[in-house]
Amino acid sequence: SIPWNLERITPPRYRADEYQPPDGGSLVEVYLLDTSIQSDHREIEGRVMVTDFENVPEEDGTRFHRQASKCDSHGTHLAGVVSGRDAGVAKGASMRSLRVLNCQGKGTVSGTLIGLEFIRKSQLVQPVGPLVVLLPLAGGYSRVLNAACQRLARAGVVLVTAAGNFRDDACLYSPASAPEVITVGATNAQDQPVTLGTLGTNFGRCVDLFAPGEDIIGASSDCSTCFVSQSGTSQAAAHVAGIAAMMLSAEPELTLAELRQRLIHFSAKDVINEAWFPEDQRVLTPNLVAALPPSTHENLYFQ
Amino acid sequence: GAMGQEDEDGDYEELVLALRSEEDGLAEAPEHGTTATFHRCAKDPWRLPGTYVVVLKEETHLSQSERTARRLQAQAARRGYLTKILHVFHGLLPGFLVKMSGDLLELALKLPHVDYIEEDSSVFAQ
């Protein structure tokens, strides 16, 4: 049956046993800045092009054992959530991956900046259709990272990022705090904010909306047909990147402001239990869970 | 995220150094009275001291960025410091990434075209 997360973002009219928008996102290219990925996984084979971009720090620890499957874990799962054949949101979207996170999931602001610059240069050299950039990472507040995101957004690129998994104000983290970026928090099957041990999804006024981010089934790098469940605001951001790809594929001329407005408009309202958030953050945190547009756009989204 | 709201630095550390220009025997001194600022991550464990993003003013050309980077290297060498330019930015933001001692920050902040300098820091998969 359909995974809970795909059911949650699907308009009621399309909730059959399968989630199947066959051509979702086909006009859009989604850039993923993350770990390395297993591009020959059945979920994403032929859908993800691995660029030659790599800018990562050395792994911590003297006895670190590098295993390809572990190095690829995070990125492979997210690529699957965005465009996977069976468990993806925008099954028609093509993706390009840049490696900015090492085998331990760690990167640098500078490496991310160089990655964003690489995307901008690629866009200038070979202009294509709409671009979505998925940044499933977070660090402390960074003026320069936010500035780079702002410049890329002003060049017409849609940036989607994870709010962060620190159970904290997203405004203290980057790129989550960049105003031009679509910042996504995570909710679970009960529409509760996701708890990750003592930590959990970030919140506050720098979050634009929430999306499914707990127990998300997606491609596992353990084998080319394996699946695994992962949780986090990265998974939530991947859902919104997929939804954005589908919206932009249906309406390629959408501006960032219009896309943001549509994401908010079609979101489920006031379903999140706000008691989970600190009292002073409840009024600032948007009570919105991302969803695809309903049947009024049937011809556009489900061709 | 969340457009239409004022930007907030939170605990973000900003060390503002208002510095007069020091010509150091080279042309292109900064305009009188300009202030370049230094920024670093508020979370100490995520800081990566020794690597800095030098961000130049918006309309700075690539050739000026390269010249500013070379100038920093020359001035640092005169003081006995080794520096390494790791990347020159253009296309999104003008500037360069430099590996150098934190002792050189005051010098770097006085360079022409410099808007601000940010110490590198870690980001993590979420």
């Epitope: 792994e59 911590d60 620890g61 003297t62 006895r63 670190f64 054992h65 590098r66 295993q67 572990k70 874990s73 085998c103 331990q104 999931g105 760690k106 998994n165 620190f166 990750l196 041990g197 003592t198 930590l199 949780s231 | 979370k43 100490d44 464990p45 800081r47 993590f124 998969a125």
Partner: antibody, heavy 122, light 110 residues
Framework: QVQLVESGGGVVQPGRSLRLSCAAS????????MHWVRQAPGKGLEWVAL????????YYADSVKGRFTISRDNSKNTLYLQMNSLRAEDTAVYYC???????????????WGQGTTVTVSS | QSVLTQPPSVSAAPGQKVTISCSGS????????VSWYQQLPGTAPKLLIY???KRPSGIPDRFSGSKSGTSATLGITGLQTGDEADYYC???????????FGTGTRVTVL
């Protein structure tokens, strides 16, 4: 609910070996780093070892390096501590504890077991 | 011997405030996140504070944490008899590549 239960403690002679286990339940074990911490009778807490969520990295206190091995089986939701060449000074209550998160292992420990007692005596 | 130093004991009357210091160096407190743990007599330790000043859910706001340079401080206001326990600071030490605990402080409610 979230729970850690240690087992395998007991009385052992110096120079011998012992293997401690820690059974985790109520959370996604494979998403968290795990620590062993010990406390000698009447003394303070002493960190022993840490293993990353996927087992790819291990760290040890100098006092146990080369003698103790931390490992985990994510399919069984179990953490282990293999203790070889035991000494009298290894006598303590051994706690397993969950790291606050996988990537931010230096954040500390948020869930603790009740401990298992190891006595090294001839 | 612990690389983080705490006072052996502090005491105050019910309702009063106590502070516990934890002194380290740049390789631990200076550049790493500090946590505080409470150990009630005969029980396992419990996390009180992480990331210098954040409280896990369920920990009352009577407990607070702060950091300055290479020292950290735990504050307990409105002291209650149930707060009688041993308190430990803890942090990662980058030069040791390991976690370190403070020497521990016993809090007595007079």
């Amino acid at each position: 609910q979230v729970q850690l239960v240690e087992s395998g403690g007991g009385v052992v002679q110096p120079g011998r070996s012992l293997r401690l286990s820690c059974a985790a339940s109520g959370f996604t074990f494979s998403s968290f780093g795990m620590h062993w911490v010990r406390q000698a009778p009447g003394k303070g807490l002493e960190w022993v070892a840490l293993i990353w969520n996927d087992g790819s990295n291990k760290y040890y206190a100098d006092s146990v390096k080369g003698r103790f091995t931390i490992s985990r089986d994510n399919s069984k939701n179990t953490l282990y501590l293999q203790m070889n060449s035991l000494r009298a000074e290894d006598t303590a209550v051994y706690y397993c504890a969950r790291a606050i998160a996988a990537l931010y292992y230096y954040y500390g420990m948020d869930v603790w077991g009740q401990g298992t007692t190891v006595t090294v005596s001839s | 011997q612990s690389v983080l130093t705490q006072p052996p004991s502090v005491s105050a009357a019910p309702g009063q405030k106590v502070t516990i210091s934890c002194s380290g160096s740049s390789s631990n407190i200076g550049n790493n996140f500090v946590s505080w743990y409470q150990q009630l007599p005969g029980t396992a330790p419990k996390l009180l504070i992480y990331d210098y000043n954040k409280r896990p859910s369920g920990i009352p706001d009577r407990f607070s944490g702060s950091k300055s340079g290479t020292s950290a401080t735990l504050g307990i206001t409105g002291l209650q008899t149930g707060d009688e326990a041993d308190y430990y600071c803890g942090t990662w030490d980058s030069s040791l590549s390991g976690y370190v605990f403070g020497t521990g402080t016993r809090v007595t409610v007079l």
